[in-house]
């Protein structure tokens, strides 16, 4: 998901204990709400909800090292990966637990990054070079976004990489920069 955007071809993905992509065991308990931060209120009737805030999606915690060429972060960073189909908050935990997904018949709902956070990492390099400082952008929470047939595929493609793309633009969270600028950022070792 998001971490691919860092040009860290050698990025190591280390799922935290109990945080594997498979549904956590506790989700099998009918009374347990999904851990998604933005789970929202349970709908009055699961199939009639129109409000995106009433949908929920999973936030999976992954631990990874940030790498840049031969250099690697001293400590791993933990970030969220927004995962899975969105469904009504009340149904989602049960449906996952039983291995069934609720699928909306009308508009599509996708689980995408909502909020972000910055974190400084120290990159340790071989050969006795001083540690480099680097800041990375990590997903802090996920949300369900309602997609209609008017949303094209390129927008869907963006969801995965928006999490990790370094940002600089004029707006709080612009979707993208020019390809040239992004490429330049990746080519410059930090």
């Amino acid at each position: 998901q998001g971490w691919q955007a860092f040009k860290n071809d050698a990025t190591e993905i280390i799922p935290e204990l109990g945080e594997y992509p498979e549904p956590p065991p506790e989700l099998e308990n009918n009374k347990t709400m999904n851990r998604a931060e933005n789970g929202g209120r349970p709908p009055h009737h699961p199939f009639e909800t129109k409000d995106v805030s009433e949908y929920s999606c999973r936030e999976l915690h992954f631990t990874r090292y940030v790498t840049d060429g031969p250099c690697r972060s001293a400590k791993p960073v933990t970030e969220l990966v927004c995962s899975g189909q969105c469904g009504p908050a009340r149904l989602l935990p049960n449906a996952i637990g039983r291995g069934k997904w609720w699928r909306p018949s009308g508009p599509d709902f996708r689980c995408i990054p909502d909020r972000y956070r910055a974190q400084r990492v120290q990159l340790l390099c071989p050969g006795g070079e001083a540690p480099r400082a680097r800041k990375v952008r990590l997903v802090a929470s996920c949300k369900c976004k309602r997609l209609t047939r008017f949303h094209n595929q390129s927008e869907l493609k963006d969801f995965g990489t928006e999490a990790a793309r370094p940002q600089k633009g004029r707006k709080p969270r612009p979707r993208a920069r020019s390809a040239k600028a992004n490429q330049a950022e990746l080519e410059n070792a930090y």
């Epitope: 952008r137 410059n188 930090y190």
Partner: antibody
Amino acid sequence: EVQLQQSGPELVTPGASVKISCKASGYTFTDHYMSWVKQSHGKSLEWIGDINPYSGETTYNQKFKGTATLTVDKSSSIAYMEIRGLTSEDSAVYYCARDDYDASPFAYWGQGTLVTVSA
Amino acid sequence: DVQMIQSPSSLSASLGDIVTMTCQASQGTSINLNWFQQKPGKAPKLLIYGSSNLEDGVPSRFSGSRYGTDFTLTISSLEDEDLATYFCLQHSYLPYTFGGGTKLEIK
């Protein structure tokens, strides 16, 4: 539009403390580190340190460790810098600057706060 | 600390001239460098990030380049409004460090 609005000029006596503020607007405050920079009269710029508003984690330039303290108030999107034990060497303009990850730190600056230390 | 040695400390040029100034890093193999312009009484303004990328809204007469640990800011055709002091900043190693500045005057 991203804006960083700093508090007004300060005239303080040697040995005293000063706390200057930087009010952020136009973006999600916790998404970006906030740095503080010192510029003595007619001189270059010195990085004092920065703070991660999301976690409160601070990193200081060794030169300013022990005299400068960086804090934030997340609820009001304000970053603060307090300088203690002021001397004439601390007379300067202090800037806050938003750090835009590795792409371009310091793309946005406050207007600066002039601190004058005088008996 | 990584020292950024900026030269010249001041220079005078005529309108339309090509102007160059440099910053040299005292150490470090992977310096990420920005260039700033500062006019009297104002906060610095970002011109170039990542050594060579032009910040949004900055005129294309400004450009940046690097050769190893040497970094150059070039103004291809000097204009009146370019009268200012220019600083470089390295932000790959802690603490971040600025160059001493180059004061640009118009002849």
